[in-house]
Each structure stands twice: as structure tokens, then as C-alpha cells.
């Protein structure tokens, strides 16, 4: 028995930040779970982890240097990634694992979300503007 995950096919991070919502076919209320976000086709980089438990506050961390936060809904976890670099444009996969109560459950691999990180394009004003026309 596998949990199904829905993600947006694509998101654009204009300001080097993005909210990625992972929607599950499972209610996480009063469950112990580990929700994670993975980067790359092979999911090689674990970007962020949200750990939830019926008795403790939500804990969010990244072991790989990403600036991330997480929010919990009844059937969703939203990852908020900040300070993304253009070269971190990639496909990102949501993963959910329920540790308690037994049995252990995880998800069918989702289709992922392509996060396209756009560089900040500031329009520079010329330092020495030419003489204005009459």
C-alpha cells in the first residue's frame, strides 16, 4: 500500500525563493512522519527534511546547506526554499514516510517538480546619464 503524491509540474523561483507543496493521499494528523525533498533525477541530494510527530513541534532541517522551512497541512507539507542559485535549477521530488503507527508507509515516486531558478535581473541606471534633450 503506497501513498500517492501530487506536485506542481513546474515552478519558477523569480526571487531565488519558492514554495513547493507536496500533497498526499494520506492524512498526517497524529502520525509520526518524515517528509523530505530530493534534488535530481536520481534524488541524490536530500534538500530538506520535515519531521513531524504527534507530541512534538515540527522540526525542519537541511544537511546539505539549503535554506529551507516547512509547513504542515492535514494532507500536505509545503517546503519553502530560499537563497536558491541559478545552478540549482533541477527536478525536485517529494517523499513521505510514515513511521508510526505501524506498518511503515511510503509513497510511489512522484513525477517531480522542475524548479527553474531565475537570476535577479536588476535594471542598472546609468551612472552618468547623457545630457537630456530639450
Amino acid at each position: 500500500n503506497k501513498i500517492l503524491v501530487k506536485q506542481s509540474p513546474m515552478l519558477v523561483a523569480y526571487d531565488n525563493a519558492v514554495n513547493l507543496s507536496c500533497k498526499y493521499s494520506y492524512n498526517l494528523f497524529s502520525r509520526e512522519f518524515r517528509a523530505s525533498l530530493h534534488k535530481g533525477l536520481d534524488s541524490a541530494v536530500e534538500v530538506c527534511v520535515v519531521y513531524g510527530n504527534y507530541s512534538q513541534q515540527l522540526q525542519v532541517y537541511s544537511k546539505t546547506g539549503f535554506n529551507c522551512d516547512g509547513k504542515l497541512g492535514n494532507e500536505s507539507v509545503t517546503f519553502y526554499l530560499q537563497n536558491l542559485y541559478v545552478n540549482q535549477t533541477d527536478i525536485y521530488f517529494c517523499k513521505i514516510e510514515v513511521m508510526y503507527p505501524p506498518p511503515y508507509l511510503d509513497n510511489e515516486k512522484s513525477n517531480g517538480t522542475i524548479i527553474h531558478v531565475k537570476g535577479k535581473h536588476l535594471c542598472p541606471s546609468p551612472l552618468f546619464p547623457g545630457p537630456s534633450k530639450p
Partner: antibody
Framework: QVQLVQSGAEVKKPGASVKVSCKAS????????IHWVRQAPGQGLEWIGC????????NYNEKFKDRATLTVDTSISTAYMELSRLRSDDTAVYFC?????????????WGQGTTVTVSS | DIQMTQSPSSLSASVGDRVTITCHAC??????LNWYQQKPGKAPKLLIY???NLHTGVPSRFSGSGSGTDFTLTISSLQPEDFATYYC?????????FGGGTKVEIK
């Protein structure tokens, strides 16, 4: 209270196998990894590998990948570490320890250790 | 594998001394560094997790600091029960690795 209790000391001949057990109690077995760490006489600590009882996924130190086998029996909250093709330099104390599956970075509870002596 | 280098490998100190042990990681491990104390014939005990957090029940004379590649364990005023071997361990990526240990002996 939370406890990891290991099986007793073993004496084995070179080329044989040894299987050490680690019985967990006082916590939810499927919320934690079980890790195995060894310590040769007068030496430091060496991580062998770990197993997550929830889905039986394993991680091994490359050095032990072809000789160590980690298993669990969730019905009795017990983990096992089998080391095959024993050599004299496998003589060590073998510890089981745990790390949280959701917050996995440190070992907060340890077994008492199992001495394995390999001698002809 | 991430290599962890501890220094010194041993030191002699007196009761009441301030003791500092360092641990160097060969690559950036952010704050994913833990410290353990081990006494002869016993299993290691967790002292500090995530570089600077005191584990439950550990006396406040123990403290940890650092991030990235360089970390420090400090015992502010050495007590008789603190004579032991101390290990650092990185918990950033598998395989988890330990430093070689620092033996704290009585001067």
C-alpha cells in the same frame, strides 16, 4: 527505560561467521535506525552500517559491504549483525546503537557491547 | 568518506583545568558534528549533538562549538569523572565517521 541489550561474547576460528543480536526495548522500534559500530582492542570507533526496521533498508560502510549482513526481526524488536569470513583483525567489541529515523545524526543509546575474538 | 581528525590524541590535565579538544572534518559538514565520552570497558556516551547542543543529563561544564570544518569540545573545569577518551563523529552523510579519539589523562 530505553535499552539495547546485546548477546554474549563469542570466540570464533578464522573463516567462520558470527551473528550478534541486539534487543531493543522502551521505545518504538520503527522510529529509529539500528547502527553497528566496532572497536578493536586499544583502537577507535569504526562504523559498520545501519538498518531501518521500518522498511529494512540498509547502509553499509564499503569496507564491510561484502562480509556484513544486517537484519531485523520487528516482531521481537531485535536487530542482528552477521560478519562472515572472519579474520584475526575482526577481533573487537561490537556495539549496537540507535539514531532517530526522522532526526538522524547522532547515537543517543548504546548496547553494552559484544566481544568477538577470532583466534585459531 | 569524510575523514575526521582529532587533536591532540592524548593530553594530561589536572582537576579544575580547562580542557579543549578539536576536531577537523575534511569537508564542510555544517553543524552535523557530535561528541562522545568513553570510559574503559564501557560503551560511548553522547555528550554534545549538532555541534553545540548538550545532551540530556550532561553537566553544563561540557560545551561544543564550531561549524563547517572545525569544531571544539571544551570542559570548563575538569572533574575526576571526566578522565576518559573523547570522540567526535560526523552525522552529515553516510558512512558516518569518527575521529581517532582524545585520551584525557590525570597529570
Amino acid at each position: 527505560q530505553v535499552q539495547l541489550v546485546q548477546s554474549g561474547a563469542e570466540v570464533k576460528k578464522p573463516g567462520a561467521s558470527v551473528k550478534v543480536s541486539c534487543k531493543a526495548s522502551g521505545y518504538t522500534f520503527t522510529s529509529y535506525y539500528i547502527h553497528w559500530v566496532r572497536q578493536a582492542p586499544g583502537q577507535g570507533l569504526e562504523w559498520i552500517g545501519c538498518i531501518y526496521p521500518g522498511n529494512v533498508n540498509t547502509n553499509y560502510n564499503e569496507k564491510f559491504k561484502d562480509r556484513a549482513t544486517l537484519t531485523v526481526d520487528t516482531s521481537i524488536s531485535t536487530a542482528y549483525m552477521e560478519l562472515s569470513r572472519l579474520r584475526s583483525d575482526d577481533t573487537a567489541v561490537y556495539f549496537c546503537t540507535r539514531s532517530h529515523y526522522g532526526l538522524d545524526w547522532n547515537f543517543d543509546v548504546w548496547g553494552q557491547g559484544t566481544t568477538v575474538t577470532v583466534s585459531s | 568518506d569524510i575523514q575526521m581528525t582529532q587533536s591532540p590524541s592524548s593530553l594530561s590535565a589536572s582537576v579544575g583545568d580547562r580542557v579543549t579538544i578539536t576536531c577537523h572534518a575534511c569537508q564542510n559538514i555544517y553543524v552535523w558534528l557530535n561528541w562522545y565520552q568513553q570510559k574503559p570497558g564501557k560503551a560511548p556516551k553522547l555528550l554534545i549533538y549538532k555541534a553545540s547542543n548538550l545532551h540530556t543529563g550532561v553537566p553544563s561544564r561540557f560545551s561544543g562549538s564550531g561549524s563547517g570544518t572545525d569544531f571544539t569540545l571544551t570542559i570548563s573545569s575538569l572533574q575526576p569523572e571526566d578522565f576518559a577518551t573523547y570522540y567526535c563523529q560526523q552525522g552529515q552523510t553516510y558512512p558516518y565517521t569518527f575521529g581517532g579519539g582524545t585520551k584525557v589523562e590525570i597529570k
